[in-house]
């Protein structure tokens, strides 16, 4: 299976955690506008997570447009120097457990759980379906396993998972065995498949973060979320590389596709951005 055709590379300290935008306009597509001037401007690319150059026509467009690279960075990037990955033997909570619950900028609201550092408990909130931060768990149990203290005042196994043969799902284990995987890819890879609002039946793929594989689904042709790819390969490139595999001595290796990188093709227009 080509899905298993992977190489291993050491993870670096500059690897970014899932994207958290400072301003909603940073998620807008670069818009050159209807005019015909040729003006060098910069925009924030949510896929590469970098400020990039584009040619602006001189009128209209949107707020994701900056005169200089520095201005773009100032408005749309934040210091990602602090790594949020902890070694397998550390007892303290991952840093993201202390982040405020973040619904993100989209509006496909679904139930998620976050660790409330004030109450020291995992609680429910409504997640918009894209972006946000890593204090965001699909189940209460997963949140508790990663962020809540164990009965003796220390962490239960933060990332321990076991494949459940009955329903092919991942179930958290409250043991001290080092885990195999963590997810640090784009946050939309963690969102459920969303058919959207129209009536078409297009063959698409979404990343199932529970089983760690790309699976087919029927897309209606509009709406939905970013976890939506035209091919299995594209889905794997975007999401499979986000799994970080642990090795026994607490080191980290990242599973990475051998194939050439390809930019994820997603219609930004389908992101419902809310006022912030």
């Amino acid at each position: 299976d080509s899905e298993e055709d992977e190489e291993h590379t050491i993870i670096t300290d500059t690897e970014l955690p899932p994207l958290k935008l400072m301003h909603s306009f940073c998620a807008f597509k670069a818009d050159d506008g209807p005019c015909k001037a040729i003006m060098k401007r910069f925009f924030f690319n949510i896929f590469t997570r970098q400020c990039e150059e584009f040619i602006y026509g001189g009128c209209e467009g949107n707020q994701n447009r900056f005169e200089s690279l520095e201005e773009c960075k100032k408005m749309c990037t934040r210091d990602n120097a602090n790594r949020i990955i902890k070694t397998t033997l550390q007892q303290e909570k991952p840093d993201f457990c202390f982040l405020e619950e973040d619904p993100g900028i989209c509006r496909g609201y679904i139930t998620r759980y976050f660790y409330n550092n004030q109450t020291k408990q995992c609680e429910r909130f409504k997640y918009g379906g894209c972006l946000g931060n890593m204090n965001n768990f699909e189940t209460l149990e997963e949140c508790k396993n990663i962020c809540e203290d164990g009965p003796n005042g220390f962490q239960v196994d933060n990332y321990g998972t076991q494949l459940n043969a009955v329903n092919n799902s991942l179930t958290p284990q409250s043991t001290k065995v080092p885990s195999l995987f963590e997810f640090h890819g784009p946050s939309w890879c963690l969102t459920p498949a969303d058919r959207g609002l129209c009536r078409a039946n297009e063959n698409r793929f979404y990343y199932n973060s529970v089983i760690g594989k790309c699976r087919p689904f029927k897309y209606s042709g509009c709406g939905g979320n970013e976890n939506n790819f035209t091919s299995k390969q594209e889905c794997l490139r975007a999401c499979k590389k986000g799994f970080i595999q642990r090795i026994s001595k607490g080191g980290l290796i990242k599973t990475k596709r051998k194939r050439k990188k390809q930019r994820v093709k997603i219609a930004y227009e389908e992101i419902f951005v809310k006022n912030m």
């Epitope: 139930t111 409330n116 909130f125």
Partner: antibody, heavy 118, light 112 residues
Framework: EVQLVESGGGLVKPGGSLRLSCAAS????????MSWVRQAPGKGLEWVST????????YYADSVDGRFTISRDNAKNSLYLQMNSLRAEDTAVYYC???????????WGQGTLVTVSS | DVVMTQTPLSLPVTLGQPASISCKSS???????????LNWLQQRPGQSPKRLIY???KLDSGVPDRFTGSGSGTDFTLKISRVEAEDVGVYYC?????????FGQGTKVEIK
């Protein structure tokens, strides 16, 4: 004892603005998401807006999005609702409510009446 | 948005007799996490709403056990086993499963 006390309501002309406040006591305010819900005279309840524990993120009903702004000051144990471009249909009693760990409203204030009329 | 429909809208009852209010939602209130976020509020005349029941059947602290909530999916019921004078008021069901939160129109309970 959990207490939520709203204030700031009154009579305002269409297009005008008003700022509601909700003073919270009897619980650790910063631990809870908070909401505003309104009730038009003789009518049912309508959810208006919710703000996360730290105040960085917000949710709005479509009917008020772009006109109303929810905010909070955890140091002052206070929740606010800035209402701009008010319309006659915004006339209602506005309640602040606390969200529990299930993201459900558990405690409600006594409400403050906002009347939008020329 | 999810539409919540309550019946009846008015419920005259005799003191000491049972009362039942129905609440139906336009779509299932069973969330992805396996919980059903259906709740009941009581609003006594001239007062603010007070939560009675959450997650279909859990009673809030201080709520008399003559109140019971039941149901699943789209059909829910609030029952008062023996109505007392202090139970007069408007009862609302509301859902916290889907965003935005939505409320029923309310059922006015009054003494015959």
């Amino acid at each position: 004892e959990v207490q939520l006390v709203e204030s700031g309501g009154g009579l305002v002309k269409p297009g005008g603005s008003l700022r509601l406040s909700c003073a919270a006591s009897g619980f650790t305010f910063s631990s809870y998401a908070m909401s505003w819900v309104r009730q038009a005279p003789g009518k049912g309840l309508e959810w208006v807006s919710t703000i996360t524990t730290g105040g960085s993120y917000t949710y709005y009903a479509d009917s008020v999005d772009g006109r109303f702004t929810i905010s909070r000051d955890n140091a002052k144990n206070s929740l606010y609702l800035q209402m701009n471009s008010l319309r006659a249909e915004d006339t209602a009693v506005y309640y602040c409510a606390r969200q529990d760990g299930n993201f459900l409203m558990d405690y409600w204030g006594q409400g403050t009446l906002v009347t939008v009329s020329s | 948005d999810v539409v919540m429909t309550q019946t009846p809208l008015s419920l005259p009852v005799t003191l000491g007799q049972p009362a039942s209010i129905s609440c139906k939602s336009s779509q299932s209130l069973l969330d992805l996490d396996g919980k059903t976020y259906l709740n009941w509020l009581q609003q006594r005349p001239g007062q603010s709403p007070k939560r009675l029941i959450y997650l279909v059947s859990k009673l809030d602290s201080g709520v008399p056990d003559r109140f019971t909530g039941s149901g699943s999916g789209t059909d829910f019921t609030l029952k008062i086993s023996r109505v007392e004078a202090e139970d007069v008021g408007v009862y609302y069901c509301w859902q916290g499963t889907h965003f935005p939160f939505t409320f029923g129109q309310g059922t006015k309970v009054e003494i015959k």
